[in-house]
């Protein structure tokens, strides 16, 4: 069974920012938006809060990406390669929290994985990651 | 254990499947240390274009 809740918002995370695009289970389109000129995408430097795993709140000016010239409906430009990646995390146990994107456990794991990939592939060509799903091993 | 599935996007021509997997495997140890995630059974595959939201399920090894 898939570990992601149906109809949840998925995020393309890239370069420390994120662009949101909501999909429904029936959607056949790409569940994220990639601006055609990624490096030139304008950002809105609005403060946001991130819940941490100590139940504190972090305030910074590292914002979600806002594309002023693009709608939130999924878009694709040519010149993009996609790779599907899967792996096991052997020191974690799957539980129902990983089926619910609103839980702290889900959000913490998603945050860690997103940050890890942003760092591993930050040099050259990486546009982002999307559709993180969790399921039992 | 937990299986994680996701999609990575790159500018076309900048990386191939082998390099995606190699780079990820290179940092598995650091991931264990930094994020407390012990990673194994890494699998990477191309997602054919046009991409669909369901294409995950056809490419899991």
């Amino acid at each position: 069974a898939s570990g992601s809740a149906s109809g949840s918002a998925s995020t393309l995370v890239h370069n420390g920012t994120s662009a949101r695009a909501t999909t429904t289970p029936a959607s056949k389109s790409t569940p994220f938006s990639i601006p055609s000129h990624h490096s030139d995408t304008p950002t809105t430097l609005a403060s946001h809060s991130t819940k941490t795993d100590a139940s504190s709140t972090h305030h910074s000016s590292v914002p979600p990406l806002t594309s002023s010239n693009h709608s939130t409906s999924p878009q694709l430009s040519t010149g993009v390669s996609f790779f599907f990646l899967s792996f096991h995390i052997s020191n974690l146990q799957f539980n129902s929290s990983l089926e619910d994107p609103s839980t702290d456990y889900y959000q913490e794991l998603q945050r860690d994985i997103s940050e890890m990939f942003l760092q591993i592939y930050k040099q050259g060509g990486f546009l982002g990651l999307s559709n993180i799903k969790f399921r039992p091993g | 254990s937990v299986v994680v599935q996701l999609t990575l996007a790159f500018r076309e021509g900048t990386i191939n499947v082998h390099d995606v997997e190699t780079q990820f495997n290179q940092y598995k140890t650091e991931a264990a240390s930094r994020y407390n995630l012990t990673i194994s059974d890494v699998s990477v595959s191309d997602v054919p274009f046009p991409f669909s939201a369901q294409s995950h399920h056809h490419h899991h090894h």
Epitope: Q119 | A32, Y35
Partner: antibody, heavy 122, light 106 residues
Framework: EVQLVQSGAEVKKPGASVKVSCKAS????????INWVRQAPGQRLEYMGW????????KFNEKFKGRVTITVDTSASTAYMELSSLRSEDTAVYYC???????????????WGQGTTVTVSS | DIQLTQSPSSLSASVGDRVTITCSAS?????IHWFQQKPGKAPKLWIY???NLASGVPSRFSGSGSGTDFTLTVSSLQPEDFATYYC?????????FGGGTKVEIK
């Protein structure tokens, strides 16, 4: 020149909380992790946790989870570590130290604050 | 958690002596870091990734090892080298430190 400057010594009663600050300068604050490490008198160094100022993401040693809060104020290039429900065993020098994201993680914690002495006593 | 055991816990040596400190891990690690600490001061990164000298560290210091056994060696001890040395692993979370080796003047 890279510098991490910590707040001054604190004396606290058991059950209280303490908040230690660590102001960074000489580099781009959001590019590096900040770690917190403590050292009780005559004891080995003990790792507490980290925060990534670029995202606010953090992680804690299970020993301290639930009692420690690590935050940053990016506009002030300052990290904070708050430890609650203090007990006498928390008497220690608390250090902040910066390190690197991938792929430079293996460089280690290369700059440290001068340390903040926290004394817990009734 | 991975335990790091340093030996000896302390040693007395003279200027010019060759000194070796060992760090043994309870399970295999990819690499270790070494820190130098003097009384009342913060630790300083001394050797990173097992064998790389940190900035400003004299070439008389060297590090080696793999798996579970690592060493820090000073080829010819100098007065400024008297301090406590700690090893650290970061192959497993949480990072852990050895108990330290205090190098004293004989």
């Amino acid at each position: 020149e890279v510098q991490l400057v910590q707040s001054g010594a604190e004396v606290k009663k058991p059950g209280a909380s303490v908040k230690v600050s660590c102001k960074a300068s000489g580099y781009t604050f959001t590019d590096n992790y900040i770690n917190w490490v403590r050292q009780a008198p005559g004891q080995r160094l003990e790792y507490m946790g980290w925060i990534y100022p670029g995202s606010g993401n953090n992680k804690f040693n299970e020993k301290f989870k639930g009692r420690v809060t690590i935050t940053v104020d990016t506009s002030a290039s300052t990290a904070y570590m708050e430890l609650s429900s203090l007990r006498s065993e928390d008497t220690a020098v608390y250090y902040c130290a910066r390190d690197y994201p991938f792929p430079s993680y293996h460089y280690g914690m290369d700059y440290w604050g001068q340390g903040t002495t926290v004394t817990v006593s009734s | 958690d991975i335990q790091l055991t340093q030996s000896p816990s302390s040693l007395s040596a003279s200027v010019g002596d060759r000194v070796t400190i060992t760090c043994s891990a309870s399970s295999s690690v990819s690499y270790i870091h070494w820190f130098q600490q003097k009384p009342g001061k913060a630790p300083k990164l001394w050797i990173y990734s097992t064998s790389n000298l940190a900035s400003g560290v004299p070439s008389r210091f060297s590090g080696s090892g793999s798996g579970t056994d690592f060493t820090l060696t000073v080829s010819s001890l100098q007065p400024e080298d008297f301090a406590t040395y700690y090893c650290q692993q970061r192959s497993s979370y949480p990072p852990t430190f050895g108990g330290g080796t205090k190098v004293e003047i004989k």
